[in-house]
């Protein structure tokens, strides 16, 4: 039950996560003009990792595409790059979760194939989350780099009189999301590689005993290495039959050994 | 096409309140627009006074900001102004005027005279 | 706030003749997020509001003729009418829109010479 509920935790946990990736990916507010000294401004601009706006006060808005792709920095190029590999892996870690959950039944798929199909979604997850994570914190290293480098030069004098004032730019909403949505996927993949290792039908203990009993005589599998995987000890003891064969409601999805702490 | 009416007293006394009432028709007073007043003193330029926008927020001008204050009514799609403690020098040709793209007033009312006088 | 001063206070042309009021800021209306200038300039004739000519410095407002032109960026910009026309007679002002609060130029007036 235990593995069940840890299993379909990390899927939920994770699709929150990409779907959370994916929002802060399209989102235009990576970066937002920075309102150190005017809370109230005419024009407010904010960029994202495919367009910029401006936000007029009067309501209007307009947003214009990076049009060029050799004309972008290499910084932004990666930061797409990380976050689109991200996306992908997760979509892809979605997918073969689906098929991996416990609860869902997919002709006699094996325990041995979910429980490696839970470990390679897991281990995607955790990619999917540290690349999202690693791609909002170039982008956020990038904008305190650009925000220091304006900030010595924030007025630059023309002619005396006249000044420019440069537009600083500050973390945007996208940052935070993706920061979070990277983190619940990265959890969500150690919680899928967890819920493996209580999937593994741990066949050389199975073997060692079983094959050894006689025809009529049962024998049990101890509980130690299941204990030693950190799922507690075994309180639900299956008789395991000559040959190994299974029993028949180990061969339905009802509740298994491997349901209970 | 938007457009505003101007309605108010002509008259009023120095130290008193002005209040103006703006009409809007031709468009919602709650779509993605600011709404302005302007003012025209007799013969002079044109002084921006402050603005409610589509959200509700006002900004105002700092040289008036202790005396003015915008306000709308959605339900009669009508915006307003109030000006305390008017003097002579508040005697002007009062506009509402629409801004959009470019913060730029898009469309202006006829523009209503207050003369401040006792 | 941002001081906008135009020159000249006024200006006598001739009828199909060109037309140039320039306008000045105290400080840039140049929006580096989308490479826009926050300048507008509107005409106003006796006895009406004023009516909006040119936004963003150079876009003109649709209805206008395109005799008149706007050009400029950061601090110094010009209205051209290339051709004056006898409507064209009026008080012409220049606005920035990029920092609160809103300016006006002191305006400048056409006439016919």
């Known amino acids: 039950m235990a593995v069940t509920a840890c299993q379909g935790l990390g899927f939920v946990v994770s699709l929150i996560g990409i779907a959370g990736i994916i929002a802060a990916t399209c989102m235009d507010q990576w970066s937002t003009q920075d309102l150190y000294n005017n809370p109230v401004t005419a024009v407010f601009n904010y960029q994202g990792l495919w367009r910029s706006c401006v936000r007029e006060s009067s309501g209007f808005t307009e947003c214009r595409g990076y049009f060029t792709l050799l004309g972008l920095p290499a910084m932004l190029q990666a930061v797409r790059a990380l976050m689109i590999v991200g996306i992908v892996l997760g979509a892809i870690g979605l997918l073969v979760s689906i098929f991996a959950l416990k609860c869902i039944r997919i002709g006699s798929m094996e325990d041995s194939a979910k429980a490696n199909m839970t470990l390679t979604s897991g281990i995607m997850f955790i990619v999917s989350g540290l690349c999202a994570i690693a791609g909002v914190s170039v982008f956020a290293n990038m904008l305190v780099t650009n925000f220091w480098m304006s900030t010595a030069n924030m007025y630059t004098g023309m002619g005396g009189m006249v000044q420019t004032v440069q537009t600083r730019y500050t973390f945007g909403a996208a940052l935070f999301v993706g920061w979070v949505a990277g983190g619940l996927t990265l959890i969500g993949g150690v919680m899928m590689c967890i819920a493996c290792r209580g999937l593994a039908p741990e066949e050389t203990n199975y073997k060692a005993v079983s094959y050894h009993a006689s025809g009529h005589s049962v024998a049990y599998k101890p509980g130690g290495f299941k204990a030693s995987t950190g799922f507690g000890s075994n309180t639900k003891n299956k008789k395991i039959y000559d040959g190994g064969a299974r029993t028949e409601d180990e061969v339905q999805s009802y509740p298994s050994k491997h349901d209970y702490v | 096409q938007v457009q505003l009416q101007e309605s108010g007293p002509g008259l009023v006394k120095p130290s008193e309140t002005l209040s103006l009432t703006c009409t809007v028709s031709?468009?919602?007073?709650?779509?993605?627009?600011?709404w302005n007043w302007i003012r025209q003193p007799p013969g002079k330029g044109l002084e921006w006074m402050g603005y409610i926008n589509y959200s509700g927020n006002t900004n105002y001008n700092p040289s008036l900001k202790s005396r003015i204050t915008i306000s709308r009514d959605t339900s009669k799609n009508q915006f307003s102004l109030k000006l305390s403690s008017v003097t002579a020098a508040d005697t002007a040709v009062y506009y509402c005027?629409?801004?959009?793209?470019?913060?730029?007033?898009?469309?202006w009312g006829q523009g209503t005279l207050v003369t401040v006088s006792s | 706030d941002i001081v906008m001063t135009q020159s000249p206070d006024s200006l006598a042309v001739s009828l199909g003749e060109r037309a140039t009021i320039n306008c000045k800021s105290s400080?840039?209306?140049?929006?580096?997020?989308?490479?826009?200038?926050?300048l507008a300039w509107y005409q106003q004739k006796p006895g009406q509001p004023p009516k909006l000519l040119i936004y963003w410095a150079s876009t003109r407002e649709s209805g206008v003729p395109d005799r008149f032109s706007g050009s400029g960026s950061g601090t110094d910009f010009t209205l051209t009418i290339s051709s004056l026309q006898a409507e064209d007679v009026a008080v012409y002002y220049c606005?920035?829109?990029?920092?609160?609060?809103?300016?006006f130029g002191q305006g400048t007036k056409v006439e016919i010479k």
């Open positions: 031709g468009g919602s007073i709650s779509s993605n627009y600011a």
């Open positions: 005027a629409t801004s959009y793209y470019g913060n730029s007033f898009i469309y």
């Open positions: 400080q840039s209306l140049l929006n580096s997020g989308n490479q826009k200038n926050y």
């Open positions: 606005q920035q829109a990029y920092s609160f609060p809103w300016t």
